[in-house]
Structures are given as C-alpha cells and as structure tokens.
Interface confidence: medium
C-alpha cells in the first residue's frame, strides 16, 4: 500500500536541514525522494496537477491539503485542493501552503529563516559555535564527550539515534534533539508529506519498533478527517 | 532519582527583585532544558522561561519579557531566575521543571509575595 | 493570545469513567497533535500524567488514557478512586513564538 511505501514516522522522510543532512551516516533522518509525491493512490510529477481522491492530508502533495470540494460538501467526497495562501482563511496547518502554518484561523508566515537558525543553534549547542549549520558535518560526526559519558536515558540531548540507549531514538523536541521511546504497538505514530510546514515541526515521534509500520487506527477510518490517529500496527 | 529543590522566594515590594535557584541532582543536568512555571494562589499554571542546555537559548513569556531573566550554571548543577522589576500580579509559587518528555519531573515550589 | 480551554469541574463515582477535554486552536492542539496532561493534588507539585497526546510515563497508572480529536484532546480516567481526586491542567505547545501554553485547570471531585 502507499502507507507502507511511504512508512514515515517523523525522522523518517524529513528533507534537511531541519531534519538533518540526507544519507548521512549515522543520522535516523533521511530524506524522501524530491522527484515524486503522492497525490491520492499514485505518485504524481509536480507539474502534473490534477485532483486525486484523498482521505487525508498525507495522501496530496506538498502543496496540496485534503477536504470535500464543495463549502459544507459531503465529507465523504474529499479531493487534493491547492494549498492556501498567506493571510488566507485556514483550519490547520496542512491548509497553508509552504512557509506558512495556521494560526487562528489565518495562514502566516512560518518565518523559516528565524525558526531554522533557532534550532540550528540549539542542536549545535554542544559544540560551543553558535554558528554551525546542520549541514556542517564536520561538526556532528562526535558528540561532546564532556556532555555523554554513556548512552543518553530518555529526555536526553542527543545529536542522533545512536547516541540513544536501546530502545530510544532520536528525535526533535522543543528547540533541540532528544532520545524518546521507540513506538509501541497501539501507540501513536506521524506519517509525513514533504511539506514545508515540517519546519514548525517541534516535536518528533520515534519509529514504530520492529514488526510494526505506522498505519491508521482500523476503527478511524470512518471518523473526521481531523481525528484520523495512525497507530504502530503489525504488519 | 531526579530531585529539583527551589529556593529564594520570599516577600518582596513592588519593583524590587529576586533571584530564585533550584538544584538539580539524580540526572545529567547539562543534557537537558530546564524550565520554570508560576502559579499565583488560586490560579492555574503559567509557564515563565525555559532555558536550553548549554544556557545559550532563552525563551520566555510576554508576562516577564525584559523583567526576568533565566540562567543556568552547570557545574552547579543549579537553574536560576533573576526577577526584576516585581509586580504584585508576579506572586506565585516558582517551580523549576526538567524539560524532557515535556516538563517531567518538577520541584516542590518556593513561594513568591510581591506586596507593600 | 492562545488559550486552552478546559472545564473547571468535573466529578465521578468510585469506579466510574470521567473525561476531561481541552480545546485549542489549529497553532497548538490541533496544529500539533501533541498534548500533555498534568496532576495536581492540593500543595503539592504537577506530575506529568500523559505526553504526546496517548502515552504514559513509567509509573503512571493504566487507568489514565489520552486521546486527541480536531482541536479538542481529552484525558479520561477509568475505574475512579478517591485519590485521582485533584486538579488537571492539559498542556500544549505555541509556535510564534515558541512558548508552553496551559489550560485552566479542571477540578476533579471523587464523589461519596
């Protein structure tokens, strides 16, 4: 299925920088195919617009949002519509397009630049140089030995997975990076477009653990688009 | 296991100041953000400041902004407020709060009277 | 401002099930899917109850459960006891700029 295809629980499926640098070694961050998206059941070109079916965001492109067609349509009808633009009316942030979240109702600026070199700052903390970027690899290849003596314990800083004890990942929360629980079954889980709202993304889940893909509830498909849950499921 | 301990409150007149510590112990205090959240008697909580591990990384609430100041001392182990300018709506009780899986482990609180 | 709105009161039986909810706006609850729930008994300090929305920290009851629909979460306690009795505040998080944002606090009464 697309689910599966695309199994992609928060650091998984990020672009960079925010979600750090892509294929790089060590990093549980990787990022998706910049090519293809999926509109509706089949992936689609970018410049090859047109309304799929949808059941949720997710399933539209990155400048898409799904929702009926029609004002107070049947909600059982939902199509890709074009992504809203700033100080344009909204419901969510998935409503606005890239650069832009929802806030009382009303798309604005994400103001990327500020957000971006916030976290940047954060994450590179440990290094004492406030301006490394995420994409300085130089800089993340080592954690500062004097701040990890040992695998980081949950609610820990960390600069990647492996920095992580068993059983923990490495994730964003807050303005910086730390070791959270892998997901359980039953859990909740967040499966990802390539959107530029991830920058307002502070707060990352884990993978689902082994055996299990992120998937929505069973016994959600029939509610409202806004309370679909994905879960850790078997296989 | 995790242990935050406030100090430093007290009674203070309006536009006076106060410096609020907790020290922290049971964990590694410089791998993790802290925080601290107010609740004036009767009332909810508030979040007041939180600070990032290495201290370089501040945000606080339109409340205090410009009036307190939030710092850290790792190899204290201790979190501080520096409150200035106090108002009398600033009367709380202080708690510092480690932020990890959000704010998951806090302290018992040190109380703040702002009167003449 | 961003507010969280919660109902000042609430209160059950013994064994029974009770909810609390938590309205938001698209910026926090239900921009983010991410809600805490906290536990406050009286002098004492909040316990981080629920995180991200459905899970539980080590050591907190099973009876405790969160769920999250829109721009509404909820904390539902099952099998009520004397000492749930307390207050909760849901918890969530602003973009613009980032800061924690509190609901007003529900006042949990365990009935008879």
């Known amino acids: 299925t697309l689910n599966s295809v695309l199994n992609s629980n928060a650091i998984k499926n990020l672009p960079p920088p925010l979600g750090g640098a892509a294929g790089h070694p060590g990093s549980a961050v990787s990022a998706a195919p910049g090519i293809l998206y999926p509109g509706g059941n089949k992936y689609q070109t970018i410049d090859n617009y047109q309304p799929y079916p949808c059941a949720e965001d997710e399933e539209c492109g990155t400048d898409e949002y799904c929702a009926s067609p029609t004002r107070g349509g049947d909600a059982g009808v939902q199509i890709c519509l074009a992504c809203r633009k700033r100080r344009k009316r909204c419901m969510r942030h998935a409503m606005c397009c890239p650069g832009n979240y929802c806030k009382n109702g009303i798309c604005v600026s994400s103001d990327q630049n500020n957000f971006r070199g916030e976290i940047e700052e954060t994450i590179t903390e440990s290094f004492g140089n406030d301006h490394s970027t995420l994409d300085g690899y130089s800089r993340r290849t080592t954690l500062s030995s004097k701040m990890y003596h040992s695998k980081g314990q949950e609610g820990s800083v960390c600069l990647r997975s492996s920095d992580c004890a068993t059983g923990l990942c490495c994730a964003r929360h807050f303005w910086s990076k730390i070791c959270k629980p892998v997901l359980k079954e039953g859990q909740v889980c967040t499966k990802h477009r390539r959107k530029g709202s991830h920058g307002l993304e502070i707060f990352q889940r884990c993978y689902c653990g082994e055996g299990l893909s992120c998937r929505i509830q069973k016994d959600h498909h029939q509610a409202s688009n806004s309370s679909r849950l994905h879960t850790c499921q078997r296989h | 296991q995790v242990q935050l301990v406030e100090s430093g409150g007290g009674l203070v007149q309006p536009g006076g100041s106060l410096r609020l510590s907790c020290a922290a112990s049971?964990?590694?205090?410089?791998?993790?953000?802290m925080s601290w959240v107010r609740q004036a008697p009767g009332k909810g909580l508030e979040w007041v400041s939180g600070?990032?591990?290495?201290?370089?990384?501040?945000h606080y609430a339109d409340s205090v902004k410009g009036r307190f100041t939030i710092s850290r001392d790792n190899s204290k182990n201790t979190l501080y407020l520096q409150m200035n300018s106090l108002r009398a709506e600033d009367t709380a009780v202080y708690y510092c709060?480690?932020?990890?899986?959000?704010?998951?482990?806090w302290g018992q609180g040190t109380l703040v009277t702002v009167s003449s | 401002d961003i507010a969280l709105t919660q109902p000042a009161s609430v209160s059950g039986s013994p064994g029974q099930s009770i909810t609390i909810s938590c309205t938001g706006t698209?910026?926090?609850?239900?921009?983010?899917?991410?809600v805490s729930w906290y536990q406050q008994h009286p002098g004492k300090a909040p316990k981080l109850m629920i995180h991200?929305?459905?899970n539980r920290p080590s050591g907190v009851s099973n009876r405790f459960s969160g769920s999250k629909s829109g721009n509404t979460a909820s904390l539902t306690i099952s099998g009520l006891q004397a000492e749930d009795e307390a207050d909760y505040y849901c918890?969530?998080?602003?973009?613009?700029?980032?800061?924690?944002?509190f609901g007003g606090g529900t006042k949990l009464t365990v009935l008879g």
């Open positions: 709060a480690r932020m990890g899986i959000d704010l998951d482990y």
């Open positions: 049971g964990f590694t205090f410089s791998s993790y953000w």
């Open positions: 600070i990032s591990y290495s201290g370089s990384n501040t």
């Open positions: 698209s910026s926090d609850v239900g921009g983010f899917n991410y």
């Open positions: 991200d929305g459905s």
């Open positions: 918890q969530s998080w602003d973009v613009s700029p980032i800061t924690a944002v």
